[in-house]
């Protein structure tokens, strides 16, 4: 039949299609953190560079006030790395004194705030005990996964101790998301 | 007006579109490293398997001489894992002797080289102090993020000490990139 | 020549195209594991939540009996994080007694099973020595990379010791895949 040559197979869908370059995307990089007030049982949120160096936001993905703002509903891949550094944790000192001890820890949480839910939703958590024996220690925690997000959702990165975050280089601590 | 029935909404873009299977992609896997000369303050680059086993390059993404070559401009997700292994680090030995010590460390850097820019750009860094107390240690560093790259850019993976890289299995140490 | 006006440039391909929202995708989250029999030299596989909370499967990507089932051939990004936690490893106790020791370890493997191939294929491995000095320890292993999969392939996550997996929170231990 006329015009059938291009009839799509069951695997091909022609609409609505979109140019990949038009999808919301962001890669944010670390900046020096200013201490901010946070609730007692809530980890503080990091703020980010969104336009200098390697950082960018595009296609209606905006950054404001610690948050990545999701401009359209869909499935997003979200990732972050936070590099921590510190002096010897108390843990090893106490251990040397012969007392067992709950180790210190470092934690990163990627959190979603949505207007359809009264509490933040923890999407991803990386948590690690730190019981280092050297005089200085440093290490990254990396997270990444895919989530279904709604237009208007807000994403942030929370950490257990903002003073331990290595803010010295944009390639060490970062946060990003892109619509799949 | 005639032909207006299919006017796209502001969220739908019809051109230029591309088949996803046509996008540049690569997954490279570890091979045994041959010691190579590198500049004193520059980490050595790893070389990779690009076609055997799990490794592949496709759609004009090519691998040559330690570099992934970017065939077209766009936003890419880039990732790498390097598994390190070694004997007890000096750190713990010195610590046992009662002297404080800067810890040993392991570092992975994904680096971009652009012809039009004199200096390589560090896109991603994972760095970790190693102060292990067992006789042998091993651990991975994983990195991944999205970057805007230009046609002709070259990507490589640098490590702090090539002799500590675990090259025994293709699933332990790898490097990849794909156009979003 | 007639009809040539719309010939795509070498960068633009118009068919077969597909709506991104139609691609197979899954994000699975941890559940409490029931001890299962496994072969002596084979790591046990985790089972997962596939529809509650943050977990989902869509577009013919199905989960059944520890496996993600790949519904169509193509390049997939596959990822997993497993958070482990345990008491002080024997390693440090033995070390204190003055005997050198092969450290304990934690390992995650993302494995592909193909009907046409007798042996499972290890796609990704994260393995880490554990020689902790605190009384309790916890830490994540993250993996993620791109692989060419065939319709009918099955993916699973294996771990070295199922009893050390932190199953308490859906954001700590997870497994996902999506068609690129």
């Amino acid at each position: 039949l006329k015009g059938q040559e291009f009839a799509p197979s069951h695997q091909q869908v022609y609409a609505p299609l979109r140019a990949d370059g038009d999808k919301p995307r962001a890669h944010l990089t670390v900046v020096r953190q200013t201490p901010t007030q946070h609730f007692k049982n809530q980890f503080p949120a990091l703020h980010w560079e969104h336009e200098l160096g390697l950082a960018f936001t595009k296609n209606r993905m905006n950054y404001t006030n610690k948050f990545l703002l999701i401009p359209e509903s869909g499935d997003y891949f979200i990732y972050s790395q936070v590099t921590f550094r510190g002096m010897t944790s108390e843990c090893s000192e106490i251990r040397q004194a012969g007392r067992p001890n709950k180790p210190d820890s470092i934690t990163v949480v990627i959190t979603k705030v949505t207007d359809s839910y009264p509490e933040p939703t923890q999407l991803l958590m990386g948590t690690k005990s730190v019981c280092e024996v050297g005089s200085n220690w440093f290490q990254p925690i990396y997270l990444g996964a895919m989530f279904s997000l709604q237009e208007g959702d807000k994403l942030m990165v929370n950490v257990s101790d903002i003073s331990l975050v290595d803010y010295t280089k944009e390639d060490k601590t970062f946060f990003g998301a892109f619509l799949l | 007006l005639k032909g207006q029935e299919f006017a796209p909404s502001h969220q739908q873009v019809y051109a230029p579109l591309r088949a996803d299977g046509d996008k540049p992609r690569a997954h490279l896997t570890v091979v045994r490293q041959t010691p190579t000369q590198h500049f004193k303050n520059q980490f050595p680059a790893l070389h990779w398997e690009h076609e055997l086993g799990l490794a592949f390059t496709k759609n004009r993404m090519n691998y040559t001489n330690k570099f992934l070559l970017i065939p077209e401009s766009g936003d890419y997700f880039i990732y790498s894992q390097v598994t390190f292994r070694g004997m007890t680090s000096e750190c713990s030995e010195i610590r046992q002797a009662g002297r404080p010590n800067k810890p040993d460390s392991i570092t992975v850097v994904i680096t971009k080289v652009t012809d039009s820019y004199p200096e390589p750009t560090q896109l991603l860094m994972g760095t970790k102090s190693v102060c292990e107390v067992g006789s042998n240690w091993f651990q991975p560093i994983y990195l991944g993020a999205m970057f805007s790259l230009q046609e002709g850019d070259k990507l490589m993976v640098n490590v702090s000490d090539i002799s500590l890289v675990d090259y025994t299995k293709e699933d332990k140490t790898f490097f990849g990139a794909f156009l979003l | 020549l007639k009809g040539q006006e719309f010939a795509p440039s070498h960068q633009q391909v118009y068919a077969p195209l597909r709506a991104d929202g139609d691609k197979p995708r899954a994000h699975l989250t941890v559940v409490r594991q029931t001890p299962t029999q496994h072969f002596k030299n084979q790591f046990p596989a985790l089972h997962w939540e596939h529809e509650l909370g943050l977990a989902f499967t869509k577009n013919r990507m199905n989960y059944t009996n520890k496996f993600l089932l790949i519904p169509e051939s193509g390049d997939y990004f596959i990822y997993s994080q497993v958070t482990f936690r345990g008491m002080t490893s024997e390693c440090s106790e033995i070390r204190q007694a003055g005997r050198p020791n092969k450290p304990d370890s934690i390992t995650v493997v993302i494995t592909k099973v193909t009907d046409s191939y007798p042996e499972p294929t290890q796609l990704l491995m994260g393995t880490k020595s554990v020689c902790e000095v605190g009384s309790n320890w916890f830490q994540p292993i993250y993996l993620g990379a791109m692989f060419s999969l065939q319709e009918g392939d099955k993916l699973m996550v294996n771990v070295s010791d199922i009893s050390l997996v932190d199953y308490t929170k859906e954001d700590k231990t997870f497994f996902g895949a999506f068609l690129l």
């Epitope: 905006n62 006030n65 610690k66 359809s116 509490e119 933040p120 208007g152 | - | -």
Partner: antibody, heavy 116, light 106 residues
């Protein structure tokens, strides 16, 4: 301590614009979403719209969309509601509501009567 | 719009009784909310996400359900529970409330 306080004229003439302000304290407005909900006499609750104070992005009830505007002034910790072309049917108690990111919190409500 | 149909519109029960209110959404929703409103007061959130108890809310209040059918229960009615109870969905635009259930003591 979390507080949301609605303020504005209690009486508005028909066809005019109703304006209310919600002043918040005890939390960072940018970490949440701020809504306006109204309750007409003897009736149930009606959601009017919301603003994301971080971005200024708004969503409105389609039944009111042509008449309602919600804005924010983060420097003053305030969210404002404007409802144009009011009629007697807009007589209601208007509530400012916080949601998302923190437990729900409601203002005590502000009664606005539309009458000539 | 997602219509919320709440039943009954009113009920009378004795102190200590188990009270159940249902809410049906015209299409599936992920999260359901239940509010208590006493005369002259602002509504107070009791249940979020269908079954989670809001902070400071007594454990005699509970919620359950998924998709289109949701239930709110007071396991043992107390005098201070006299109020009107509303269900609400926060997902579709507009957000919509049920018409309310007035609970009285016999």
């Amino acid at each position: 301590q979390v507080q949301l306080q609605e303020s504005g004229p209690g009486l508005v003439r028909p066809s005019q614009t109703l304006s209310l302000t919600c002043t918040v304290s005890g939390f960072d407005m940018g970490d949440t979403y701020m809504h306006w909900v109204r309750q007409r006499p003897g009736r149930g609750l009606e959601w009017m719209g919301r603003i994301d104070p971080a971005s200024g992005h708004t969503k409105y009830n389609p039944s009111l969309k042509s008449r309602v505007t919600i804005t924010r002034d983060t420097s003053k910790n305030q969210v404002s509601l404007r409802l144009s072309s009011v009629t007697a049917a807009d007589t209601a108690v208007y509530y400012c509501v916080r949601s998302g990111g923190m437990p729900d919190a409601w203002g005590q409500g502000s009664l606005v009567t539309v009458s000539s | 719009d997602i219509q919320m149909t709440q039943s009954p519109s009113s009920l009378s029960a004795s102190v200590g009784d188990r009270v159940t209110i249902t809410c049906r959404a015209s299409q599936g929703v992920m999260y359901m909310y239940w509010y208590q409103q006493k005369p002259g007061k602002a509504p107070k959130l009791l249940i979020y996400g269908a079954s989670n108890l809001a902070s400071g809310v007594p454990s005699r209040f509970s919620g359950s359900g998924s998709g289109t059918d949701f239930t709110f229960t007071i396991s043992s009615l107390q005098p201070e529970d006299i109020a009107t109870y509303y269900c609400q969905q926060w997902e579709g635009n507009p957000r919509t409330f049920g018409q309310g259930t007035k609970v009285e003591i016999k």
